[in-house]
């Protein structure tokens, strides 16, 4: 018969022959022959392979280095890598999460639009008219100006994006 030019899923072509790939969690020891099956070997502790493969070496699990602000989110298995995330108050610098940086704070005049997570930084927004923030914070939103009217007071000093309005008593009409 003609030697194959393509193989089925979970197979690979070698020496004009279709051999079975090794399943996730195992690596290739030797290719199949006309008389023998592909020989695979389980990955050892701290190693993994996450696909059907013909790799001769398993990959080492990622190390979540506490010195870089990292911690383990999910422990690796023979078929999955370890997933790292950042300690509280920090977030990953990249999708691979190889190191962490401190969440940014929103300066006075800006409020938190979206609180940071282990994988994304704080998103700040300028306080619009009618709102203010007088602190640098990683979790405070812009606060609305105090409504003097509801307190039966009048605005004595206008608010800004960094300061609240100052309310005071209404001037009495002289008789």
């Amino acid at each position: 018969p003609e030697p194959p030019t393509a193989c089925r899923e979970k197979q690979y072509l070698i020496n004009s022959q279709c051999c079975s790939l090794c399943q996730p969690g195992q690596k290739l020891v030797s290719d199949c022959t006309e008389f023998t099956e592909t020989e695979c070997l389980p990955c050892g502790e701290s190693e993994f392979l996450d696909t059907w493969n013909r790799e001769t070496h398993c990959h080492q699990h990622k190390y979540c280095d506490p010195n870089l602000g990292l911690r383990v989110q999910q422990k690796g298995t023979s078929e999955t890598d370890t997933i790292c995330t950042c300690e509280e108050g920090w977030h990953c610098t990249s999708e691979a999460c190889e190191s962490c940086v401190l969440h940014r704070s929103c300066s006075p005049g800006f409020g938190v639009k979206q609180i940071a997570t282990g994988v994304s930084d704080t998103i700040c927004e300028p306080c619009p008219v009618g709102f203010f923030s007088n602190v640098s914070s990683a979790f405070e939103k812009c606060h609305p100006w105090t409504s003097c009217e509801t307190k039966d007071l009048v605005v004595q000093q206008a608010g800004t994006n960094k300061t609240d309005v100052v309310c005071g008593p209404q001037d009495r009409l002289r008789a």
Partner: antibody, heavy 118, light 106 residues
Framework: EVQLVQSGAEVKKPGATVKISCTVS????????IHWVKQRPGKGLEWMGR????????KYDPKFQGKVTMTADTSTDTAYMELSSLRSEDTAVYYC???????????WGQGTTVTVSS | QIVLTQSPTIMSASPGEKVIITCSAT?????ILWFQQKPGTSPKLWIY???NLASGVPARFSGSGSGASYSLTISRMEAEDAATYYC?????????FGGGTKLEIK
């Protein structure tokens, strides 16, 4: 800094039980396996078993099955190994150690000497 | 279970001499770890994943091998290398150690 600190030396009578502790710092104990290794005086290293502190899953060398019980307390980052029905051949230094790739060190405790003597 | 046999059991080498310690397994394993132990101290991880030097290990050490046959090599023996070396497999339970190779300085 990663450290594994073991409890102090023990002297026990034959038939007694001993429980050794291994407290880790510098990482969460639930994130890595803890292995226990035996070394009799002047002899080589023997792997006794390991525990996954996250779920308590254990694997023992059949030679130590029934002799050893491994447990862990994630709230105190401490692993324990209990040896029961002690005999003179249990006289040894016992070490706890981590999964090998923790920071490319395989961290080891300082060892706990257990002496079984009547 | 996998039995690891180390060879030689004991050896001595002169400073500057090349040293090779072998570790053979009764069947294929994914990788080998090597540990160094000096009297009265805890073992130290020396080589991981067959060929990677652990932190602080001098570059004169190397590891190689695959399947059931592995080795640790010291390119030029130094006095501080005198110790007992153990191989270990962590592929199949129960994990096992080799019997150890005691390396002395001449």
């Amino acid at each position: 800094e990663v450290q594994l600190v073991q409890s102090g030396a023990e002297v026990k009578k034959p038939g007694a039980t001993v429980k050794i502790s291994c407290t880790v710092s510098g990482f969460n104990i639930k994130d890595y396996y803890i292995h226990w290794v035996k070394q009799r005086p002047g002899k080589g290293l023997e792997w006794m078993g390991r525990i996954d502190p996250e779920d308590g899953d254990t694997k023992y060398d059949p030679k130590f099955q029934g002799k050893v019980t491994m447990t862990a307390d994630t709230s105190t980052d401490t692993a324990y190994m209990e040896l029961s029905s002690l005999r003179s051949e249990d006289t040894a230094v016992y070490y706890c150690t981590t999964s090998y790739y923790v920071g490319t060190y395989g961290y080891w405790g300082q060892g706990t000497t257990v002496t079984v003597s009547s | 279970q996998i039995v690891l046999t180390q060879s030689p059991t004991i050896m001595s080498a002169s400073p500057g001499e090349k040293v090779i310690i072998t570790c053979s397994a009764t069947s294929s394993v994914s990788y080998i770890l090597w540990f160094q132990q000096k009297p009265g101290t805890s073992p130290k991880l020396w080589i991981y994943s067959t060929s990677n030097l652990a932190s602080g290990v001098p570059a004169r050490f190397s590891g190689s091998g695959s399947g059931a046959s592995y080795s640790l090599t010291i390119s030029r023996m130094e006095a501080e290398d005198a110790a007992t070396y153990y191989c270990q497999q962590r592929t199949f339970y129960p994990y096992t150690f080799g019997g150890g190779t005691k390396l002395e300085i001449k």
